[in-house]
Interface confidence: medium
């Protein structure tokens, strides 16, 4: 395991840094200049550095389970789990599911009443007794309810011509009811006669386009538990149709833009606000059904089976059955679908914050195992045969105390999981012995926690009214820098640099910004090796006799001497036996400067004063022209001809000497003075 830590100064921060991090609480474990963060490392590292095993703090994640023996039938156990989570380290516990025999069932029959379902309605009217009998074969407590749907009552979903709204059926003689979005006809009951009576009163209706408003109806069935009469038992929703469905976005066709709000809007058992809200999205409906533990059974005609199978991939705990054209096989279909649904168990949890991650290992009774899945999943689950799920919960940080619920989808049982942080270190401190902290603090996990007004490793520094920010300020190079360059501790406003594990590396400087190894190398050695130079603060400091950025050159100037044996002609410096010339002067010896401006104009006043003792510098010529020496004999060099202060032309020659702005000057005896106009 690894321990990647950043700026750790307490046991808690260490534990938060990762599951591989442990803390040494041993007194005086750190040496002078060592940061408190070296107490935080992997267990093997701390043991290697002399921390005794019982001085190593390494809290672990753990799970405590509690059974709740109150109440009736329990298919899930345990009922309550308490987890203590250390960041990055999973806590695991087992959940057992035992499918009970004869678990109570509520079945709500939701039927499409568009005109093409006319023959189906005839059959369903006779169905009440058969349905309840079929349920009673499975459970001792079954109830049935009934609802119907058509579509939103606006164009283009229905024909809004007043006559067509009164009777939407193609056959005018046929008694038909006006279209509607969803009608809740019969609350869940165990009275089959009541089912027969209420369903018997239902009339067929009709609409315009092929898809129906079935998702609207399903949403209301899920969102209105009191009105529908759902008990806290297995909830089945049989959805019978011979066509497709509208979903979110289709409402725009009828100028309905408000998204479905997933709330109950039944008035007088009718969804009267269907023309205000768009259809729900499939995801929204799936969430609502799962939230209310409702398992849909799509009873659809053969041409629609594929469409609804796609829907079951999105809606968990749902099934599809092929409905005969007249719905005569519906009881058989429901039995099959129920068996299919109840033999598949999904274990899932409610929404969690990003700081918690849950995975499931499913150990199914048929020998199949699924590991590290986002939810538990076992198929072919038989009555009274237990299956086990291992649930692993990991926190990514020190979490707030919170709870979440695990449920088997479609069943009412839940496991309540209480989650607590496991971030505190229960250190064995002589907390009351304040002498180790200069009497100005107490010991916590091997380090001093100082009283107000004191800081430092042993609370040795009195802040004297200065805030710790002010003190820390003098340990930063500038506002953007980190304290002591991240390589030292700020003690009383001064950096105490850490000792380094790297051989030959010394960290130093006012802000611990310097070290002794990060320098250029020569011959594979830092600064050419200790015989040539030393590395300090990123720069090689060469011993006398050596030079260069890596002390790679022996100090000799032979290659830099001009014929007069002047180093770089006085216009550069010799480094590594090669001239570095001042700007413009050319290698090898800085003698020529082809690009330099002509010196003629600069020295006319000097020529005038040196030769003729006239002009602006006449009185203090030597001070004004220190680099010039007058020659009585002609010299080689640059020939100049300039006007003097009296307007006369003066000819002179400048011969450059070694050094900057140093010349030998020869001035012609005669000046050319042009007489002005009379």
């Amino acid at each position: 395991q690894e321990c990647t830590k950043f700026k750790v100064s307490s046991c808690r921060e260490c534990i938060e840094s990762g599951p591989g991090c442990t803390w040494c609480q041993k007194l005086n474990f750190t040496g002078p200049g060592d940061p408190d963060s070296i107490r935080c490392d992997t267990r093997p590292q701390l043991l290697m550095r002399g921390c005794a095993a019982d001085d190593i703090m390494d809290p672990t994640s753990l799970a405590e389970t509690q059974e709740d023996h109150n109440g009736g039938q329990k298919q899930l156990s345990p009922q309550k789990v308490t987890l203590y989570l250390r960041p990055g380290q999973a806590a695991a516990f087992n959940v057992t599911f035992r499918r009970a025999k004869g678990y109570p069932i509520d079945l709500y029959y939701l039927m499409d009443l568009s005109y093409s379902m006319l023959d189906d309605l005839r059959n369903v009217k006779k169905l009440g007794g058969d349905l309840l009998r079929a349920l009673n074969e499975i459970t001792e407590s079954g109830r049935i309810g009934f609802g119907s749907f058509v579509d939103k009552t606006v164009l283009p979903f229905v024909n809004t011509h007043p006559d067509k709204l009164r009777n939407p059926c193609p056959n005018k003689e046929k008694e038909c009811q006006p279209p509607f979005a969803f009608r809740h006809v019969l609350k869940l009951t165990n009275n089959s006669n009541q089912f027969q009576t209420e369903v018997g009163k239902q009339l067929i209706s009709g609409n315009l386009d092929a898809p129906e408003g079935g998702l609207d109806a399903m949403m209301q069935v899920a969102a209105c538990p009191e009105e529908i009469g759902w008990r806290n038992v297995t909830r089945l929703l049989v959805f019978a149709t011979d066509d497709g469905f509208h979903f979110a976005g289709d409402g725009k066709l009828g100028a309905i833009l408000t998204p479905n709000d997933g709330r109950c809007h039944l008035e007088d058992n009718l969804y009267k606000r269907s023309n205000e809200f768009d259809y729900p999205s499939v995801g929204q409906l799936a969430h609502k059904l799962a939230e209310n533990n409702i398992q849909p059974i799509f009873a659809v005609t053969s041409r629609m089976v594929k469409t609804y199978e796609k829907l079951t991939e999105i809606i968990p705990k749902s099934a599809v059955g092929e409905l005969s054209e007249d719905s005569s096989n519906v009881v058989h279909l429901i039995k099959n679908a129920y068996n299919k649904l109840s033999s598949r168990v999904f274990l899932d949890h409610n929404a969690l914050p990003d700081t918690l991650k849950v995975t499931y290992d499913s150990f199914c009774s048929n020998g199949v195992t699924h590991r590290n899945q986002p939810r538990g999943d076992c198929d072919g689950v038989q009555i009274n045969v237990p299956i086990t799920f291992q649930v692993k919960v990991t926190a990514t940080e020190c979490i707030q105390e919170q709870s979440f619920v695990i449920r088997a989808l479609g069943f009412t049982d839940i496991v309540t999981v209480q989650v607590l942080p496991q971030c505190e270190c229960r250190c064995r401190d002589q907390s009351r012995d304040r002498s180790l902290c200069h009497g100005k603090g107490f010991l916590e996990c091997g380090i001093c926690r100082c009283d107000t007004g004191y800081i430092g490793k042993n609370c040795e520094c009195q802040t004297q009214g200065r805030s710790s920010q002010e003190l820390e300020g003098s340990c930063r190079k500038d506002n953007n820098s980190i304290i002591c360059s991240g390589l030292g501790d700020c003690v009383c406003g001064q950096c105490l640099c850490h000792t380094s594990d790297v051989p030959g590396k010394l960290i130093y400087g006012q802000y611990c910004e310097c070290d002794t190894i990060n320098c250029e190398r020569y011959n594979g050695q830092v600064c050419g090796g200790p015989g040539r130079g030393l590395c300090f603060c990123g720069k090689c400091r060469c011993h006398p006799g050596f030079e260069g950025s890596a002390c790679q050159c022996e100090r000799t100037t032979e290659g830099c001497l001009n014929p007069r044996r002047v180093e770089c002609s006085g216009r550069g410096r010799c480094r590594c036996n090669v001239c570095e010339c001042h700007s413009g002067y050319q290698l090898p010896l800085c003698q020529e400067c082809p690009g330099c401006p002509s010196p003629c104009g600069k020295y006319i006043s000097c020529a005038e004063c040196l030769k003729f003792e006239k002009g602006p510098f006449g009185k203090n010529c030597s001070a004004a022209c220190p680099g010039l020496q007058l020659s009585n004999n002609p010299v080689k060099g640059r020939t100049c001809k300039e006007r003097d202060s009296e307007g006369c032309w003066v000819a002179y020659t400048l011969e450059q000497q070694d050094g900057m702005d140093r010349y030998l000057i020869y001035v012609d005896e005669s000046r050319e003075c042009v007489a002005g106009p009379n």
Epitope: G504, L506, G509, T516, P530, L534, F536, R541, H543, P544
Partner: nanobody
């Protein structure tokens, strides 16, 4: 700016021992290294040994295993223990320090002592 005071030189017979010491004082921010150069008559000055701030040492090949350099950081002092001395060790020994002077940024400066004579007679 920085003063170096040397002591311990003298006359010794072949195979004998001497201990040189060198104390640095002045406006020192940090001593990076201390050591000794030597210059024999008619020869160039050569680096004999240095000890770096972190305690690492360097010896020229001619003195390896005979000379030992050590230092007392608290006193800014270096010591050179010279054993098994040979006539070719005869020279003026110059104490040398490379320091960062207070207020000089992070630039280093080299300082030399006045030198102390070591003579090894045969």
């Amino acid at each position: 700016e920085v003063q170096l005071v040397e002591s311990g030189g003298g006359l010794v017979q072949t195979g004998g021992s001497l201990r040189l010491s060198c104390a640095a004082s002045g406006s020192i921010f940090m001593i990076l290294a201390m050591g000794w150069y030597r210059q024999a008559p008619g020869k160039q000055r050569e680096l004999v040994t240095t000890i770096i701030r972190d305690g690492k040492t360097y010896y020229s090949d001619s003195v390896k295993d005979r000379f030992t350099i050590s230092r007392d950081n608290a006193k800014n002092t270096a010591y050179l223990q010279m054993n098994s001395l040979k006539p070719e060790d005869t020279a003026v020994y110059y104490c040398y320090t490379k320091v960062i002077v207070m207020g000089a940024g992070m630039d280093d400066n080299d300082f030399f002592g006045q030198g102390t004579q070591v003579t090894v007679s045969s």
